[in-house]
């Protein structure tokens, strides 16, 4: 369990940099995370909205807080979900 946990952690941390990338090859991963964010009302992988780098400037709706019952915070003048997606992803992988 702890070994698979470590592998998942390392993989997610490594892939965090893909969110701030602007190339076509990273688009598929970004789109998958966007869908995940919308479903689980979370933002980014490790550092929240900051994980998206300059992409956040162009698409601040990426993490937009649409549910006032969930913890939200201001980031670059926008209300975004406070919780990162890493724990949700780990739970999701564990269940599936």
């Amino acid at each position: 369990k702890s070994k698979s946990d470590r592998i998942v952690n390392e993989t997610l941390y490594e892939n965090t940099k893909l969110l701030s990338a602007t190339g076509e090859s990273e688009k598929q991963f970004q789109e998958a995370i966007i869908v995940f964010q919308e479903e689980f009302k979370c933002c980014g992988l490790v550092n929240g909205a900051a994980d998206w780098g300059n992409n956040f400037q162009h698409y601040p709706e990426l993490c937009a807080c649409l549910d006032k019952q969930r913890p939200c915070q201001s980031y670059n003048g926008k209300q975004v979900y406070k919780e990162t997606c890493i724990s949700f992803i780990k739970d999701f992988l564990a269940k599936n």
Partner: antibody, heavy 116, light 109 residues
Framework: EVQLLESGGGLVQPGGSLRLSCAAS????????MSWVRQAPGKGLEWVSA????????YYADSVKGRFTISRDNSKNTLYLQMNSLRAEDTAVYYC?????????WGQGTLVTVSS | QSVLTQPPSASGTPGQRVTISCSGS????????VYWYQQLPGTAPKLLIY???QRPSGVPDRFSGSKSGTSASLAISGLRSEDEADYYC???????????FGGGTKLTV
């Protein structure tokens, strides 16, 4: 090319029900949130409802909450709006739109008339 | 009564610059992106500006958006007759937990 085609509109009596459909093509439907926006004759735009890509989250305007239900079938690339307990003030052209932040593509709309 | 306030009408002559305002509050414009939509007579709305000031591909650079505090504005320069339409601002209101539109501005050229 992104295409959204609404259907199911028509004339219905107050208190009646109607189900609108929106057939989507030209994009990966299951990757996008979807919305319904309406426009009463000669009036402005009013957001009605939105649904997340996997249907986990739904959102409704206060004016339709408890009466309308948004749903989707990702295997059929189709968005739905079940409208119950219809009122005269629900008379409008109903547009299906991709996403909700922002609505980046719109269908041509279907007219719903609620009248006795 | 719309949550976002827009002037009901605006006008200009060909070649002129016109600005349409959109006023809101901290629960909508102040903390979220603003979007602008153009609705030509008898047609469905079309996205004109997203994320306060970004233009989707295909939208001429004559259209520009800006935001300051709880207000936003849409500027159209080099006005053309085909710009005659209704313009709506919109954003998410996290107090209402819903998307809100301005009442719309009818632009006459």
């Amino acid at each position: 090319e992104v295409q959204l085609l609404e259907s199911g509109g028509g004339l219905v009596q107050p208190g009646g029900s109607l189900r609108l459909s929106c057939a989507a093509s030209g994009f990966t439907f299951s990757s996008y949130s979807m919305s319904w926006v309406r426009q009463a004759p000669g009036k402005g735009l009013e957001w009605v409802s939105a649904i997340s890509p996997g249907s986990s989250n739904t959102y409704y305007a206060d004016s339709v909450k408890g009466r309308f239900t948004i749903s989707r079938d990702n295997s059929k690339n189709t968005l739905y709006l079940q409208m119950n307990s219809l009122r005269a003030e629900d008379t409008a052209v109903y547009y299906c739109a991709r996403k909700h932040m922002p609505f980046d593509y719109w269908g041509q709309g279907t007219l719903v008339t609620v009248s006795s | 009564q719309s949550v976002l306030t827009q002037p009901p009408s605006a006008s200009g002559t060909p070649g002129q610059r016109v600005t349409i305002s959109c006023s809101g509050s901290s629960s909508n414009i102040g903390n979220n992106s603003v979007y602008w939509y153009q609705q030509l007579p008898g047609t469905a709305p079309k996205l004109l500006i997203y994320s306060d000031s970004q233009r989707p591909s295909g939208v001429p650079d004559r259209f520009s958006g800006s935001k300051s505090g709880t207000s936003a504005s849409l500027a159209i320069s080099g006005l053309r007759s085909e710009d005659e339409a209704d313009y709506y601002c919109g954003t998410w209101d996290y107090s209402l937990n819903g998307y809100v539109f301005g009442g719309g501005t009818k632009l006459t050229v």
